[in-house]
């Protein structure tokens, strides 16, 4: 019986050209995590294997960095990076748990523009 739950960073936004950390956390289970696959829609970004360590897909090698932890760091973001990301936890004996993150890459940061103006 699968008792675990995946907590994610949920819906997040980041600025074009910047970087973002995608994080998932598996809780409420004693199952052993054997591997975590990170996917963007149907594309594999990276795999973190408990024995073999991190392996980044060749097409993302320049823009994806492993970690922190089982998370994934996306760098040099473009508007095309907007979309759904999935962390797929392979565990024993439970099986597979999947978490979803929606990333929106913005042309510019509203927060940064706002910080330029000070109210006297």
């Amino acid at each position: 019986m699968m008792t675990g739950t995946i907590e994610t960073t949920g819906n997040i936004s980041a600025e074009k050209g910047g970087s973002i950390i995608l994080q998932c956390h598996l809780s409420s289970t004693t199952a052993q995590v054997t591997q975590v696959n990170w996917e963007q829609q149907d594309q594999l970004l990276a795999i973190c294997n408990a024995d073999l360590g991190w392996h980044i897909s060749p097409s993302f090698k320049d823009r994806v960095a492993p970690g922190p932890g089982l998370g994934l760091t996306l760098q040099s973001l473009t508007v095309n990076d907007t979309g759904e990301y999935f962390c797929i936890y392979h565990t024993y004996p439970d099986g597979t748990y999947t978490g979803r993150i929606f990333l929106e890459v913005l042309e510019s940061s509203v927060a940064e523009h706002g910080a330029r103006f000070q109210i006297p």
Epitope: T34, Q35, N37, I47, N49, L52, H55, I88, H90, T96
Partner: nanobody
Framework: EVQLVESGGGLVQAGGSLRLSCAAS????????MGWFRQAPGKEREFVAS????????NYADSVKGRFTISADNAKNTVYLQMNSLKHEDTAVYYC??????????WGQGTQVTVSS
């Protein structure tokens, strides 16, 4: 399922060389990386080296860097471990492992490497 068969182990003098091979068969399309591990008597299994199947990205344990080289022949679905400047502490059973997209590693039966002083 993925089957792994190791070969090339044996007895070698300290300072000598050996080349281990690991042939994969079965559902090899499911493999994204392969690696070598070793287990010495009375010790836990430890990582030695790995190589990604999609490119030539390699990783090594600090204890073997500069002495061991992992390589792959994708056409033959075979991974190799060239071991040079062998030391007594390299004595162990060496296991091949295949990391699979489906989440579970496949393991070989192991090949014994003994380095005599």
């Amino acid at each position: 399922e993925v089957q792994l068969v190791e070969s090339g182990g044996g007895l070698v003098q300290a300072g000598g060389s050996l080349r281990l091979s690991c042939a994969a068969s079965g559902s090899t399309f499911d493999i994204y990386a392969m690696g070598w591990f070793r287990q010495a008597p009375g010790k836990e299994r430890e990582f030695v080296a790995s190589i990604s199947s999609g490119d030539t990205n390699t990783n090594y344990a600090d204890s073997v860097k500069g002495r061991f080289t992992i390589s792959a022949d994708n056409a033959k679905n075979t991974v190799y471990l060239q071991m040079n400047s062998l030391k007594h502490e390299d004595t162990a059973v060496y296991y091949c492992a295949a990391g699979r997209y489906s989440g579970y590693n496949s393991w070989g039966q192991g090949t014994q490497v003994t380095v005599s002083s």
